[in-house]
């Protein structure tokens, strides 16, 4: 491949250049922008992502980056000034310039001899820059998201194209298509590819129809498909649930607001460990399930489910996935049991006029120091399973 001539500011003595073979993607990403197709340019070095040198940033590199990311061509290439008040404001969007009076060394440069990413090379420690960073806004400012699914990793599939968020039609929508969505969003793999009406219908345009991914694509817009012009309505909006999405249920209680806490994560129902199950976690879960607030955290029972999830909340989060959490795949809740909770909306709290001496009760020892009494009703017996 032709190698671009190094500009004056290139520190060739310490530079290690890499040229990208056909079929390899340019190791670049855009950050701090409005979508995955705009923002500050970062290049991947061996173990980290580093901002690309603004001093050596030009329209050819901008075009190549946009194409490499599947974002069309470059609409505007610019430089972002360093956060120091003495420097002049950054050039207006669309301007491309090379900084003078370069003083600092060490930033990687992205050098392109043409607008195709295969004609680019990353040169480490190459740039003596004034601290400005390369920025670009691509013409096809594309982005992807999952909405109305209770988290960033589940919901109706929406693409941003031409400045508008729109749906994807569920015709031919399958797990391979959903895999691409999940991977692109950093949400693991697809657990479900859902047809329309599993989530609330969208309102904007329908951007794609007959999507047919192989599953290997990096971006949904790389998949074969048709423009979603006339043949789909929002009742056919495609949806996806990814492995990193968390959903919760309470099992074995009188109703959905009482019981053992289980989280669906990475394709299976997992226990939540009661060794770190405190009032704040119970409160967040009850509220997120629409079950009011936590009233009781009964001691856990032995269980045989896979998975071992721990949460740490401050009590103000909307869902447990907004809390600090960790998933220990090799340790079944250590020495603890599965967490349980009784929420205020459970019917077991209502119409319970406990007499002075309880009538028919069942007593079960669940720990050396704790006994639980369960009223002898059919609906309660499940709690002991």
């Amino acid at each position: 491949h032709p190698s671009p001539a190094p500009p004056d500011q290139l520190n060739t003595s310490s530079a290690e250049s890499e040229l990208w073979e056909p079929g390899e993607r340019l190791p670049v990403r855009l950050t701090n922008g409005s979508s995955s197709c705009s923002g500050t340019v970062e290049v991947r070095l061996e173990a980290s992502w580093e901002p690309a040198c603004g001093a050596l940033w030009d329209s050819r590199a901008a075009e190549a980056v946009c194409r490499a990311l599947g974002c069309g061509g470059a609409e505007a290439a610019s430089q972002l000034a360093p956060p120091t008040p003495e420097l002049p404001p950054p050039p207006a969007a669309g301007n491309t310039s090379v900084a003078a009076n370069a003083t600092l060394a060490g930033a990687p440069a992205l050098l392109c001899s043409g607008a195709e990413w295969r004609l680019c090379e990353v040169v480490e420690h190459a740039c003596r820059s004034d601290g400005r960073r390369a920025r670009v806004t691509c013409a096809e400012n594309r982005a992807l998201r999952l909405v109305d699914g209770g988290g960033a990793c589940a919901g109706r599939v929406e693409m941003l194209e031409h400045g508008e968020w729109g749906s994807v039609c569920d015709d031919t929508w399958d797990l391979e298509d959903a895999h691409v969505v999940c991977r692109q969003l950093g949400c693991g793999w697809a657990v479900q590819a859902l047809p329309g009406l599993h989530f609330t219908p969208g309102r904007g345009p329908i951007h794609r129809d007959q999507v047919n991914c192989s599953g290997a694509e990096a971006y949904l817009w790389d998949c074969p498909g048709l423009p979603g012009q006339h043949y789909c309505g929002h009742k056919e909006d495609a949806g996806a649930v990814c492995s990193e999405h968390q959903s919760w249920r309470l099992t074995g209680g009188a109703d959905r607001c009482e019981g053992q806490v289980e989280v669906h994560f990475r394709g299976v129902w997992n226990t939540v460990c009661d060794s770190e199950w405190y009032p704040s976690e119970a409160k967040v879960l009850c509220q997120s399930l629409g079950c009011g607030t936590a009233v009781e955290r009964p001691k856990g029972l032995p269980h045989s489910l896979s998975g071992r999830m721990y949460y740490s909340c401050n009590g103000e989060e909307l869902t447990l996935s907004n809390c600090s959490w960790r998933f220990n795949n090799s340790n079944l809740c250590s020495q603890s049991l599965a967490a349980r909770v009784l929420c205020s909306a459970s019917r077991s709290l209502h119409n319970l006029s406990t007499p002075e001496v309880p009538a028919s009760v069942q007593t079960v020892t669940i720990e050396s120091s704790v006994t639980v009494k369960i009223e002898n009703k059919e609906s309660r017996e499940l709690m002991l399973l």
Epitope: Y278, P279, E296, P298, L349, T354, V370, K373, E375
Partner: antibody, heavy 119, light 107 residues
């Protein structure tokens, strides 16, 4: 104002029984879990029993399990502790305590009723 | 069960002194710790809840700190009215457990 008034304490022989009551007022009794905590003369505090707001869940430490029974009547706004097979080491001041709704600590206490187990 | 180790068991200090009582849990209790003051012949009174929150009506000379396993109650300027026994309680996990108490005397 939250008020918890214990009654029913007294002198009882070893092996005997006694029933304590705690009358609650000034708050919605049926919404709160309630507990009994005791304190032997010159000793520290020891949790004895807890009952959830609706009475579905009951907790005891090993030291009283099988001998003490906690119950409540949400209509009468009263908490009970039925004590049987009493031992000399059960001699203590017994306090009724309300459990905080959000954080679970004992936020209100009664003045206590003294139980003396002696022959 | 979580064990609470409270120290010292007794303390003698002068009016105006700054005093600190500590409680150590046998494992992390995530700030679910309450401090109580009990005067002779009286019921316990809540001073500090959730490790650092001052209960209603409690003078600001009382403060709580700590996290994880280690917690402390500090009286910034001791007053004669502070003669009492102080207890910690962990309420993160059932069974709830108290510290053994610290008897505070004024010199």
């Amino acid at each position: 104002e939250v008020q918890l008034v214990e009654s029913g304490g007294g002198l009882v022989k070893p092996g005997g029984s006694l029933k304590l009551s705690c009358a609650a007022s000034g708050f919605k009794f049926s919404r709160y879990a309630m507990s009994w905590v005791r304190q032997a003369p010159g000793k520290g505090l020891e949790w004895v029993a807890t009952i959830s707001s609706g009475g579905s869940y009951i907790y005891y430490p090993d030291s009283v399990k099988g001998r003490f029974t906690i119950s409540r009547d949400n209509v009468k706004n009263t908490l009970y502790l039925q004590m049987s097979s009493l031992r000399s080491e059960d001699t203590a001041m017994y306090y009724c305590a309300r459990r905080d709704y959000d954080l679970d600590y004992f936020d209100s206490w009664g003045q206590g009723t003294l139980v003396t187990v002696s022959s | 069960d979580i064990q609470m180790t409270q120290s010292p068991s007794s303390l003698s200090a002068s009016v105006g002194d700054r005093v600190t009582i500590t409680c150590k849990a046998s494992r992390d209790i995530r700030s679910y710790l309450t401090w109580y003051q009990q005067k002779p012949g009286k019921a316990p009174k809540t001073l500090i809840y959730y490790a650092t929150s001052l209960a209603d009506g409690v003078p600001s000379r009382f403060s709580g700190s700590g996290s994880g396993q280690d917690y402390s109650l500090t009286i910034s300027s001791l007053e004669s009215d502070d003669t009492a026994t102080y207890y910690c309680l962990q309420h993160g996990e059932s069974p709830f457990t108290f510290g053994s108490g610290t008897k505070m005397e004024i010199k």
